[in-house]
Amino acid sequence: FERTRSLQDPCSNCPAGTFCDNNRNQICSPCPPNSFSSAGGQRTCDICRQCKGVFRTRKECSSTSNAECDCTPGFHCLGAGCSMCEQDCKQGQELTKKGCKDCCFGTFNDQKRGICRPWTNCSLDGKSVLVNGTKERDVVCGPSPADLSPGASSVTPPAPAREPGHSPQ
């Protein structure tokens, strides 16, 4: 089938990085500078994307692949192929319809993007809060309140000794 197709359509032999030049008897010509073809059998090459302004070049254009852009520092890509640059917030904030806003009490965000998430509810696991949460950090859960009752040891007993040469299961 491939052989039949190539007999019918000489352009199918043109590899990525070239185009089928109708002006030159359908010879495979290299893509001109600042253009590319990512698949074979193309009749034209696509113009390379230029990362200008707030967009910076993350990957240069080649004859077989388009350039890839990212955003100026303090901003991150949004949309297909980085069509927009969205601002980073501080840790402890989230991006809302009114811009970067502090996380509400009881929520946190340890990233510069994304949303504020509720603190872990330690009591659901029968544990107590060891370290309080902040806008930037989740709570740290500790032993269950029963484990901390008077007389109860909070020291972890030593692990049983292993025979030399045996790795843990």
């Epitope: 303090g74 901003f75 969205e86 601002q87 917030c89 991006l95 809302t96």
Partner: nanobody, 119 residues
Framework: EVQLVESGGGLVQPGESLRLSCAAS????????MLWWRQAPGKERELVAA???????YYTDSVKGRFTISRDNAKNTVYLQMNSLKPEDTAVYYC?????????????WGQGTQVTVSS
Amino acid sequence: EVQLVESGGGLVQPGESLRLSCAASGDTVSGYVMLWWRQAPGKERELVAAISSVGYTYYTDSVKGRFTISRDNAKNTVYLQMNSLKPEDTAVYYCAADPASISTRSAYWGQGTQVTVSS
């Protein structure tokens, strides 16, 4: 609803300075990206400078080292300090505010202030 009012434009000679102000009212814009755009006659609107809520700044190549964008969240105001002005800086300067991104489709725009650099 945010309203933006620019001021500080005028006629100056090459090499002189101007400071543009953009006062926001109607809501606080401390969490917004604030931007200065300009449009010269017969040309496309061009992003000059931007400042994120965290304080990251962006400048177009032609103004780097000459222009400085800053914000005063307490006054709900953003500034553009323009030094060593050149005739090619002549344009109408627009302030814009967007809660999220740098885009020509910013949520809020001012009416613009004319800057003319001529000897």
